[in-house]
């Protein structure tokens, strides 16, 4: 591939398969568009990066939340 | 802390089938995936497959057809299957967690392997 | 399938720098190929160093770090000790599979 078409900050191969304690997630971001597949990528309490499914509900649930916060 | 083993039969007849199970701890498979990855005696290492959290899979495409990978997320076990074996299949089997970010090492705690040989 | 190409062996010495690389028949190694490096002790001991080009491992000495030198992926070891003896191995990342290299066997003279 190209260098122009790099992405230019975090992917991910696939999406975690648990719901996170709500309590856990301290942010977030989503990965670029240039990117193989969308992904939310929820940042914990203990620093762990998880990649998570942007169709699934409880992950828009937390993102929601997270922007209202 | 993560462990990952592998176990299985030894010695397989050629044109016979291989199941390697691969038991993990420390993590759950829910939030990983588990490459296999093999080895023949002297040689490099030959990238099998994976299977991610919500059971989805990657195959070497060379491999594909003879292929087939499954777990249990409450066993915290994941199975290799393997048909039609022969000679040059001899390796050193491994399996090995899989984070999902691609900011992490991809391949990132190894099984200590299971050794399989296919001989009559 | 790619072909990943590795230096076969290469040889240091105590608190040398020593660069590592990894080519691919394909073209250019990119950061869209997440390059990944594993070193491998005797009694078959793998231990995943490097991963996304540039990412250690926690716990890997800061020694050890990830690039991309012109259209190969390098693993450069800076002041290279004794105890990094072994084979390291290069996998890429093509889009739905990962392909190792051939390994480098690198000894370090002490």
């Known amino acids: 591939a190209p260098m122009g078409s790099d992405p230019p900050t975090a992917c991910c191969f696939s999406y975690t398969a648990r719901k996170l304690p709500h309590n856990f997630v301290v942010d977030y971001y989503e990965t670029s568009s240039l990117c193989s597949q969308p992904a939310v990528v929820f940042q914990t309490k203990r620093g762990k990066q998880v990649c998570a499914d942007p169709s699934e509900s409880w992950v828009q649930e937390y993102v929601y939340d997270l922007e209202l916060n | 802390q993560v462990q990952l083993k592998e176990s299985g039969p030894g010695l397989v007849a050629p044109s016979q089938s291989l199941s390697i199970t691969c038991t993990v701890s420390?993590?759950?498979?829910?939030?990983?995936?588990i490459h296999w990855v093999r080895q023949p005696p002297g040689k490099g290492l030959e990238w099998l497959g994976v299977?991610?959290?919500?059971?989805?899979?990657n195959y070497n495409s060379a491999l594909m057809s003879r292929l087939s990978i499954s777990k249990d997320n409450s066993k915290s076990q994941v199975f290799l299957k393997m048909n039609s074996l022969q000679t040059d299949d001899t390796a050193m089997y491994y399996c090995?967690?899989?984070?999902?970010?691609?900011?992490?090492?991809?391949?990132?705690?190894w099984g200590q392997g299971t050794s399989v040989t296919v001989s009559s | 399938q790619a072909v990943v190409t590795q230096e076969s062996a290469l040889t240091t010495s105590p608190g040398e720098t020593v660069t590592l690389t990894c080519r691919s028949n394909?073209?250019?190694?990119?950061?869209?190929?997440?390059a990944n490096w594993v070193q491998e002790k005797p009694d078959h001991l793998f231990t995943g160093l490097i991963g996304g080009t540039n990412n250690r491992a926690p716990g890997v000495p800061a020694r050890f770090s990830g690039s991309l030198i012109g259209d190969k992926a390098a693993l450069t070891i800076t002041g290279a000790q004794t105890e990094d003896e072994a084979i390291y191995f290069c996998a890429l990342w093509y889009s739905n599979h990962w392909v190792f290299g051939g390994g480098t066997k690198l000894t370090v003279l002490g």
């Open positions: 299977i991610w959290p919500g059971g989805g899979t």
């Open positions: 420390g993590f759950s498979l829910t939030g990983y995936g």
């Open positions: 090995a967690r899989g984070p999902l970010i691609t900011t992490e090492v991809s391949m990132d705690y």
């Open positions: 394909t073209g250019a190694v990119t950061t869209s190929n997440y």
